[in-house]
């Protein structure tokens, strides 16, 4: 018969013959032969492949160093790789989480729109007319001015962005 | 550890029949194609057989062709070769050895078959 | 089938010494399935090399093979006592049958 060209899912071509790829979590050690099956060992510990594969050697787990601020939000195991994230207070600079940096704080006029997580950042949005923030928060969001119309108050002075109105009494009218 | 160990041989009249068996422990047997290889007292290497992993594929060398037949039980992680119509250019030490494609990396220590009258 | 012929028949050479085995196929050995064995006296033969040029498990590297198409060598370039044996070539490209060279004895000069 003539040697293939081509092979099936989860199959490799070397050598004119189809050999099976090593299943997730175990890598090459030797071809397969027209008698032999394909040789696969698994993955030693703190390694892994995630993938049908005909690697020589397994990857390394990531390593989430606390000096840069991380920490393991999920073990690897021999087909998934460690996933990191950030202590808390922190997030990640980038999509792959290989160093984290302090949450930004909303300041003074901003209010906190979405909390940050261990790997997004603070995001803050203006106070509109009516809020006000006096901090600066990673958490505070934009509190709504004082009512004084309901303590029975007159605005004395007007709140802005940064400060909140200030009520007083309403002046007595004398007879 | 991966072992192969050889039996069955011993003195045999020319025209009688020998089965020699190969034992495998230490690896997936049933992963393995398999070889017999022989040699003549003092003389080369020569192949004899080999067997798929699962015991559909069988080559011969033509010497031992129509004479010898390989098989396998991978249940029992066992290698045979019935050897019938034997000839005293048969004498040799007979080993088992394992399929890969790096070549027969694994042997057994052999065993001998002697064919005289 | 392939013939391989290995040269010379025998090897006479001190410890120390560097030593150069040849192995010669009749046509090409597709994708270099070519081996190397050792034999002792009363042993099993115990791979080498494979695919021409690759060391197998535990083999020191003091063996090295090389060579492609019809031409390859064994070198070992310091001979150690222990390495006074017998070398086969063999092919596992091209089957049936898997040919063997007649094999080298490297003895002590």
């Known amino acids: 018969p003539e040697p293939p060209t081509a092979c099936r899912e989860k199959q490799y071509l070397i050598n004119s013959q189809c050999c099976s790829l090593c299943q997730p979590g175990q890598k090459l050690v030797s071809d397969c032969t027209e008698f032999t099956e394909t040789e696969c060992l698994p993955c030693g510990e703190s390694e892994f492949l995630d993938t049908w594969n005909r690697e020589t050697h397994c990857h390394q787990h990531k390593y989430c160093d606390p000096n840069l601020g991380l920490r393991v939000q999920q073990k690897g195991t021999s087909e998934t790789d460690t996933i990191c994230t950030c202590e808390e207070g922190w997030h990640c600079t980038s999509e792959a989480c290989e160093s984290c940096v302090l949450h930004r704080s909303c300041s003074p006029g901003f209010g906190v729109k979405q909390i940050a997580t261990g790997v997004s950042d603070t995001i803050c949005e203006p106070c509109p007319v009516g809020f006000f923030s006096n901090v600066s928060s990673a958490f505070e969001k934009c509190h709504p001015w004082t009512s004084c119309e309901t303590k029975d108050l007159v605005v004395q002075q007007a709140g802005t962005n940064k400060t909140d109105v200030v009520c007083g009494p309403q002046d007595r009218l004398r007879a | 550890q991966v072992q192969l160990v050889e039996s069955g041989g011993g003195v045999v009249q020319p025209g009688r029949s020998l089965r020699l068996s190969c034992a495998a422990s230490?690896?997936?047997?049933?992963?393995?194609?398999m070889h017999w290889v022989r040699q003549a007292p003092g003389k080369c290497l020569e192949w004899v057989a080999v067997?798929?992993?699962?015991?559909?594929?069988?080559y011969y060398a033509d010497s031992v062709k129509g004479r010898f037949t390989i098989s396998r039980d991978n249940s029992k992680n066992t290698l045979y070769l019935q050897m019938n119509s034997l000839r005293a250019e048969d004498t040799a030490v007979y080993y088992c050895?394992?399929?890969?494609?790096?070549?027969?990396?694994?042997w057994g220590q052999g065993t001998m078959v002697t064919v005289s009258s | 089938e392939i013939v391989l012929t290995q040269s010379p028949g025998t090897l006479s050479l001190s410890p120390g010494e560097r030593a150069t085995l040849s192995c010669r196929a009749s046509?090409?050995?597709?994708?270099?399935?070519l081996a190397w064995y050792q034999q002792k006296p009363g042993q099993a033969p115990r791979l080498l090399i494979y695919?021409?040029?690759a060391r197998a498990n535990g083999i020191p590297d003091r063996f090295s093979g090389s060579g492609s198409g019809t031409d390859f060598t064994l070198t070992i370039s310091r001979l150690e006592p222990e390495d006074f044996a017998v070398y086969y070539c063999?092919?596992?490209?091209?089957?049936?049958?898997?040919?063997f060279g007649c094999g080298t004895k490297v003895e002590i000069k």
């Open positions: 063999q092919q596992y490209a091209d089957y049936p049958p898997f040919t």
């Open positions: 046509q090409s050995v597709s994708y270099d399935y």
């Open positions: 695919g021409a040029s």
């Open positions: 230490g690896f997936t047997f049933g992963s393995y194609g």
């Open positions: 050895a394992r399929d890969t494609s790096r070549g027969h990396d694994i």
């Open positions: 067997i798929s992993y699962e015991g559909v594929k069988k």
